[in-house]
């Protein structure tokens, strides 16, 4: 069964800066990755970035840099101030569309106990079959 993992990290140098890393553990070919915050995409969440393996990468504030790390994992740096700034309990979700498995999504947030600069361990947070 495919899994999606999500890792959220707050940067020690900038407390309003977060790095979200997501990966897909499956054998299929990834066709699209969507990163959202405030809940799953299409269920009240707001899209921060859309990454296609060949067509390109698009992102919207407060996302600063979305990139492919490998063929099956991505990272997104967020920074903000004021209303568009993420906070410690913000939920971030990553949805991977793949062939032939379909769409798989997981969400994660910064663990309450984590210190700035420390990573939350990669969590295959509740995995939702979104298809």
């Amino acid at each position: 069964t495919p899994e999606v993992w999500v890792q959220v990290r707050m940067e020690a140098t900038e407390l309003s800066s977060f790095t979200i890393r997501c990966g897909f553990l499956g054998s299929g070919s990834i066709s699209l990755v969507t990163v959202s915050w405030g809940g799953p995409n299409g269920a009240g969440g707001t899209t921060l970035a859309v990454l296609h393996p060949e067509r390109g990468i698009r992102q919207w504030a407060p996302a600063r840099q979305a990139r492919w790390e490998t063929q099956s994992s991505i990272s997104l740096i967020l920074e903000g101030s004021g209303a568009s700034s993420p906070c410690a309990n913000t939920t971030f979700c990553c949805k991977f569309a793949s062939f032939p498995e379909g769409s798989w999504e997981a969400c994660g947030s910064l663990p309450p106990s984590s210190d700035p600069g420390l990573s939350a361990p990669p969590t295959p947070a509740p995995i939702l079959r979104a298809d």
Epitope: T46, T47, V50, R55, T70, Q71, I74
Partner: antibody, heavy 114, light 113 residues
Framework: EVQLQQSGPEVVKPGASVKISCKAS????????INWVKQRHGKSLEWIGD????????NYNQKFKGKATLTVDKSSGTAFMGLRSLTSEDSAVYYC???????WGQGTTLTVSS | DIVMTQSPSSLNVSAGEKVTMSCKSS????????????LAWYQQKPGQPPKLLIY???TRESGVPDRFTGSGSGTDFTLTISSVQAEDLALYYC?????????FGGGTKLEIK
């Protein structure tokens, strides 16, 4: 497949403003993220910016900041582009296109003339 | 901004001929994480909007005839039409799909003798 239907041609006077629309009808969420592209007669294409239907978030080509304003009405699936302080340099065909430019509207011709 | 330079600016060929056009970018369009090139090619026929032909430098969009082939990596890219047809009369544009602003080349005009 997504269809992008743009509003009709506009003829406006220098200094005026105009707002053109692009209605998307598709079946995937990426069909509603809209890019805007300018093409002057006999010239190449220029990316103006894009708009995110979730929250109206935008990205602009620096060249068009202050000239173009991109908005979206998520409920109707319609994106809008406002252009202000129009001059003859703004006379062009303006296209909307989906997130990764795989579908395009038919174009809206803007003529700025006194 | 990434500058896209296309050559030649125009081509005049006979039906059935093989055609090659070039696109060079001022910065690499290769995404190091997944080793994909974010470059697209478009065809624009008179009075029509552009149509996506190729993305990822070499992947044909659905429905595009296989006589159209994209190749290249980094900063140098090529669009090849293996056997030109009369309906291929059009302007061809390359586009940086790597980073904002998503700049287009000046175009290559394909004319049929």
């Amino acid at each position: 497949e997504v269809q992008l239907q743009q509003s009709g041609p506009e003829v406006v006077k220098p200094g005026a403003s105009v707002k053109i629309s692009c209605k998307a009808s598709g079946n995937t969420f990426t069909d509603y993220f809209i890019n805007w592209v300018k093409q002057r007669h006999g010239k190449s294409l220029e990316w103006i910016g894009d708009v995110n239907p979730d929250n109206g978030g935008t990205n602009y080509n620096q060249k068009f900041k202050g000239k173009a304003t991109l908005t979206v009405d998520k409920s109707s699936g319609t994106a809008f582009m406002g252009l202000r302080s129009l001059t003859s340099e703004d006379s062009a065909v303006y296209y909307c296109a989906t997130l990764f430019f795989d579908s395009w509207g038919q174009g809206t011709t803007l003529t700025v003339s006194s | 901004d990434i500058v896209m330079t296309q050559s030649p600016s125009s081509l005049n060929v006979s039906a059935g001929e093989k055609v090659t056009m070039s696109c060079k970018s001022s910065q690499s369009l290769l995404n190091s994480g997944n080793q994909k090139n974010y470059l697209a090619w478009y065809q624009q026929k008179p009075g029509q909007p552009p149509k996506l032909l190729i993305y990822g430098a070499s992947t044909r969009e659905s429905g595009v005839p296989d006589r159209f082939t994209g190749s290249g990596s980094g900063t140098d890219f090529t669009l090849t039409i293996s056997s030109v047809q009369a309906e291929d009369l059009a302007l061809y544009y390359c586009q940086n799909a790597h980073s904002s602003p998503y700049t287009f080349g000046g175009g290559t005009k394909l004319e049929i003798k």
